[in-house]
């Protein structure tokens, strides 16, 4: 996978999201996450793999929210 | 599954409005709800939205001045937004999705609109 | 952010023709768009998402197609009803709009 630079990209996001990625992360990858700071000029969900990648989110899409909902509730 | 907007009116520049959305036939709990606008004779503009979890997210022109909420238990959401100029003259639409179409921004229902006009 | 280009109004098709509206993303969106028709003083109704899959209840004489920054609805055997503005959606990124191309029926 293409890993870009950590404040322009979807991937090591530093503080803000620029971009979304593009593919639906397995689940099972997946530890944890946070929402990027409401100063960013747009929202982001950054999901933490087990690997250690950040990867940046767009929180309208369904898969973002139910994976939420889901570490939520675990 | 239905949802409406409160009544607009006149308003006049640096006022605040206050939008309430009221659904009926579904649950907040499973659907997200939009706000968008559309100014006289223009296209679709994005507002901001709130979560079926209660999280709400803004386009980047309304953040500074807009306030997204729900009352879960009143199946009401309720659109605040600041400073009012005449460029916020528009149709205010609210409109409901369930992420049934894999984005909670894709929205098929909305209600029909109350016009807000900002004039001096 | 991204700015999507539509046809411009009007579009003007015959009873039992065909309408092509087009729109042009400034990058890609990966088929994440949605079209919309809107009637007069109506709110916008649900035709496609995901670029050319049908919402439910929407005629199988609208098409939806196209791919990276092109995308393109097409209205087959037109009925005076489909006189309305079509808007396309973009959801991959900002939630942007497009202006609307008005379909005039004849």
């Known amino acids: 996978t293409k890993t870009e630079s950590s404040s322009r990209g979807p991937y090591h996001p530093s503080e803000c999201c620029f971009t979304y990625t593009t593919y639906k992360i397995p689940r099972q990858r997946i530890m944890d996450y946070y929402e990027t700071n409401s100063q960013c000029s747009k929202p982001g969900i950054v999901f933490i793999t087990k690997r250690g990648h950040s990867v940046c989110t767009n929180p309208s899409d369904k898969w973002v929210q139910d994976y939420i909902k889901d570490m939520k509730e675990n | 599954q239905s949802v409406k907007e409160s009544e607009g009116g006149l308003f006049k520049p640096a006022d605040t409005l206050t939008l309430t959305c009221t659904v009926s036939g579904f649950s907040l709990s499973s659907y997200a709800i939009n706000w968008v606008r559309q100014a006289p004779g223009e296209g679709l503009e994005y507002i901001g939205w709130?979560?079926?979890?209660?999280?709400?997210y803004y386009a980047s022109w309304a953040k500074s001045r807009s306030t997204i909420t729900r009352n879960t238990d009143e199946n009401t959401v309720t659109l605040k937004m600041t400073s009012l100029t005449a460029a916020d003259t528009a149709t205010y639409f609210c409109a409901g999705g369930d992420g049934s179409y894999s984005n909670y921004w894709v929205s098929d229902i909305w209600g029909q609109g109350t016009l807000v006009t900002v004039s001096s | 952010a991204v700015v999507l280009t539509q046809t411009a109004s009007p579009v003007s098709a015959p009873v039992g023709g065909t309408v092509t509206v087009k729109c042009q993303a400034s990058?890609?969106?990966?088929?994440?768009l949605a079209w919309y028709q809107q009637k007069q003083g109506q709110p916008p109704k649900l035709l496609i998402y995901e670029a050319s899959t049908l919402a439910s209840g929407v005629p199988s004489r609208f098409k939806g197609s196209g791919s990276g920054t092109e995308y393109t609805l097409t209205i087959r055997g037109v009925e005076c009803a489909d006189a309305a503005t079509y808007s396309c959606?973009?959801?991959?990124?900002?939630?942007?709009f497009g202006g609307g191309t008005e379909v005039v029926v004849k």
């Open positions: 959606q973009e959801y991959a990124d900002e939630n942007i």
């Open positions: 990058q890609t969106i990966n088929s994440r």
């Open positions: 709130i979560s079926d979890v209660g999280t709400a």
